[in-house]
């Protein structure tokens, strides 16, 4: 049974030519996790493994920095980064979950500039 | 150079309390999970408390399931271990060690602080 | 809880000679999707902690010498000191991050001749 449940970072927006993190956190499972990967839409931007580390998309490999944590760091964002983001934590015994961000990049400076996630 | 230094070991009688810390230097502590083990006088090994790099997700055994609490201080580098309702079976040498991301192994170890819990 | 277990609890060996210990488990370590056991091992020296030595079973730690090397798969597992020293000196420790709660071996006491 999957009890475990992903918390995100959820809307987000950030400006053009700036930068935002990306992060889901698993909680309330002991399944462990073997991989992370980020997608947008169905676009592989990178993947974490237990045994390889990290590896980037060669597409992306310019814009985007692994990290925080198992989390993924968007940099030079242009509008066309606007949509969905997908985290899907593969683990055992459980099985994937799978969390969304949607992200939207703004022209102008009204964008609220996306912050470290934190759990309070 | 990776440096995990415990403190905060004592002897405290059956049902005290006592709060153990880990200052870790040499990495970027943020970055890694982080466990307590445990060495019984008799030499077992036993795993106690793990907490995710950012302090989200934490386990423990049923042994010390609802006595023993860790958390972390990112922005101070630390580790602690709240131990409460010790019972005589908690006396060890009680270690913190980390753990790369994703991998549950323990790749390395601190020095040790010992807790003696006896009347 | 899987139930690592040890043998032999000790041996002693002169310098030169080749040492095998291992270490079993309840339940399987391999998963199957990467096709990884894991499985770890630790050797701690007299009035020192434990240090990692080999990690998915057969992976050797930065700077771990090459005469240990980690094998086997599943339940059964070996650790294999190809021509011991005297500074292996030491307890070596198996241990299993498969599942929660992770468990140890009770430890395998390497004595020197």
């Known amino acids: 049974m999957m009890t475990g449940t992903i918390e995100t970072t959820g809307n987000i927006s950030a400006e053009k030519g700036g930068s935002i993190i990306l992060q889901c956190h698993l909680s309330s499972t002991t399944a462990q996790v073997t991989q992370v990967a980020w997608e947008q839409q169905d676009q592989l931007l990178a993947i974490c493994n237990a045994d390889l580390g990290w590896h980037i998309s060669p597409s992306f490999k310019d814009r985007v920095a692994p990290g925080p944590g198992l989390g993924l760091t968007l940099q030079s964002l242009t509008v066309n980064d606007t949509g969905e983001y997908f985290c899907i934590y593969h683990t055992y015994p459980d099985g994937t979950y799978t969390g969304r961000i949607f992200l939207e990049v703004l022209e102008s400076s009204v964008a609220e500039h996306g912050a470290r996630f934190q759990i309070p | 150079e990776v440096q995990l230094v415990e403190s905060g070991g004592g002897l405290v009688k059956p049902g005290g309390s006592l709060k153990l810390s880990c200052a870790a230097s040499?990495?970027?502590?943020?970055?890694?999970?982080m466990s307590w083990v445990r060495q019984t006088p008799e030499k077992r090994l036993e795993w106690v408390a793990y907490?995710?790099?950012?302090?989200?997700?934490?386990y423990y055994p049923d042994t010390v399931k609802g006595r023993f609490t860790i958390s972390r201080d990112n922005a101070k580098n630390t580790l602690y271990l709240q131990m409460s309702s010790l019972k005589s079976e908690d006396t060890a040498i009680y270690y913190c060690?980390?753990?790369?991301?994703?991998?549950?192994?323990?790749?390395?170890w601190g020095q040790g602080t010992t807790l003696t819990v006896s009347s | 809880d899987i139930v690592m277990s040890q043998s032999p609890s000790s041996l002693a060996v002169s310098v030169g000679e080749k040492v095998t210990m291992t270490c079993k488990s309840s339940?399987?370590?391999?998963?199957?999707?990467?096709?990884?056991?894991?499985l770890a091992w630790y050797q701690q020296k007299p009035g020192q902690s434990p240090k990692l030595l080999i990690y998915?079973?057969?992976t050797r730690e930065s700077g771990v010498p090459d005469r240990f090397t980690g094998s086997g798969s599943g339940t059964d597992f070996t650790l294999t000191i190809s021509s011991v020293k005297a500074e292996d000196l030491a307890v070596y420790y198996c241990?299993?991050?498969?599942?929660?709660?992770?468990?140890f071996g009770g430890g395998t006491k390497l004595e020197i001749k």
């Open positions: 907490i995710s790099d950012g302090g989200y997700n934490t």
């Open positions: 040499g990495f970027a502590f943020s970055d890694y999970d």
């Open positions: 241990q299993q991050y498969h599942s929660y709660p992770w468990t």
């Open positions: 339940q399987s370590l391999l998963y199957s999707s990467n096709q990884k056991n894991y």
């Open positions: 060690a980390r753990q790369i991301l994703l991998r549950y192994y323990f790749d390395y």
């Open positions: 998915w079973a057969s």
